[in-house]
Interface confidence: low
């Protein structure tokens, strides 16, 4: 015998309380396939989520993120804060720690400044949270004990890098 519920189109549910009549999904619910015995509750895009597509009787709402945030996960299940240049998202918010930089807008992670000494080069321009160190040409001769003071832009003091 054919299941009478199979005749119920998307946007309805097969209502056992009404002798398996196809009843329209109540407000704020949907069924995207035929033959459903219940309608699913519409997703609500609240807070940092905003509505990209309204819920209809046959399809769920779709969310994206408010400005300053971007989607993560299947179907935009999470909104993650956009970080500016010079920042990455940490538990404490958007920032780059000393000695690291991020030159991308909205994405990316903070990477350590280039260690110029590994290539036998001097520091031509100090790094910032947004820009990497600029290394100069290779140093022809130097004393291994020489230190230079590197002060990040806007930073209160310096710290030493062994070159």
């Amino acid at each position: 015998l054919q299941d009478p519920c199979s005749n119920c189109p998307a946007g309805t549910f097969c209502d056992n309380n009404r002798n398996q009549i196809c009843s329209p999904c109540p407000p704020n619910s949907f069924s995207s396939a035929g033959g459903q015995r219940t309608c699913d509750i519409c997703r609500q895009c609240k807070g940092v989520f905003r509505t990209r597509k309204e819920c209809s009787s046959t399809s769920n709402a779709e969310c994206d993120c408010t400005p300053g945030f971007h989607c993560l996960g299947a179907g935009c299940s999470m909104c993650e804060q956009d970080c500016k240049q010079g920042q990455e998202l940490t538990k404490k918010g958007c920032k780059c720690s000393l000695g690291t930089f991020n030159d991308q807008n909205g994405t990316g992670v903070c990477r350590p400044w280039t260690n110029c000494s590994l290539d036998g080069r001097s520091v031509l321009k100090t790094g910032t949270t947004e820009k990497d160190v600029v290394c100069g040409p290779p140093v022809v001769s130097f004393s291994p004990s020489t230190t230079i003071s590197v002060t990040p832009e806007g930073g209160p003091g310096g710290h030493s890098l062994q070159v």
Partner: antibody, heavy 117, light 107 residues
């Protein structure tokens, strides 16, 4: 996006049987119903009948004895057959998708059928 | 079968006018009424379902109201692209039936 396309013979002789096909793309016939509607020249819309996702049908009571609606889910096609045609069956024939809130949200562009000898 | 009667059968209005089309059912149909627009080229589109719910993409100048046996489609400010024939359709009882249509023209 969802599209419905009717195809028919154009010209049919009186007393013959009309056969029209509605091909559905972008939507499953196992999730939606398809309703047939016709419009005689210069007149209004007339519902002919519907086939539901599970395959059962409902027909316009005045035309029930002459109408058969069937479908092939695998081909995404719905067919309308109407027997014993007369000049009064000359019309534009439309198929339309039926959603669960009982409206026709997508319509085909229609196919013209002329019954004449 | 439930009979649906529309009035007027045709009307002519000026751009920017407020236009109302009436639809009457031969018996009570609660709010189970839809409105469709048929353009001169034969294209049919859903405008409003369940008496007053605007279908997606339909301009907000269209609205619907009513309950029971008497229903109204209103266009708040007539635009050139609104030239069409408008049909009401009941879905309270099978077979679903249409009104006779209202042909709307611009003066």
């Amino acid at each position: 996006q969802v599209q419905l396309q009717e195809s028919g013979p154009g010209l049919v002789k009186p007393s013959e049987t009309l056969s029209i096909t509605c091909t559905v793309s972008g939507s499953s016939l196992t999730s939606y119903g398809v309703h047939w509607v016709r419009q005689p020249p210069g007149k209004g819309l007339e519902g002919l009948g519907v086939i539901w996702p599970g395959g059962s049908t409902n027909y316009n009571s005045a035309l029930m004895s002459r109408l058969t609606i069937s479908k092939d889910n695998s081909k995404s096609q719905v067919s309308l057959k109407m027997s014993s045609l007369t000049a009064a069956d000359t019309a534009m024939y439309y198929c339309a998708r039926v959603t669960g809130t009982w409206y026709f949200d997508v319509w085909g562009q229609g196919t013209t059928v002329t019954v004449s000898s | 079968d439930i009979q649906m009667t529309q009035s007027p059968s045709s009307l002519s209005a000026s751009l920017g006018d407020r236009v109302t089309i009436s639809c009457s059912a031969s018996q009570g149909i609660s709010n189970y009424l839809n409105w469709y627009q048929q353009k001169p080229d034969g294209t049919v589109k859903l405008l409003i379902y369940y008496t007053s719910t605007l279908h997606s993409g339909v301009p907000s100048r269209f609205s619907g109201s009513g309950s029971g046996t008497d229903f109204t489609l209103t266009i708040s400010s007539l635009q050139p692209e609104d030239v069409a024939t408008y049909y009401c359709q009941q879905y309270s009882k099978l077979p679903w039936t249409f009104g006779g249509g209202t042909k709307l023209e611009i003066k």
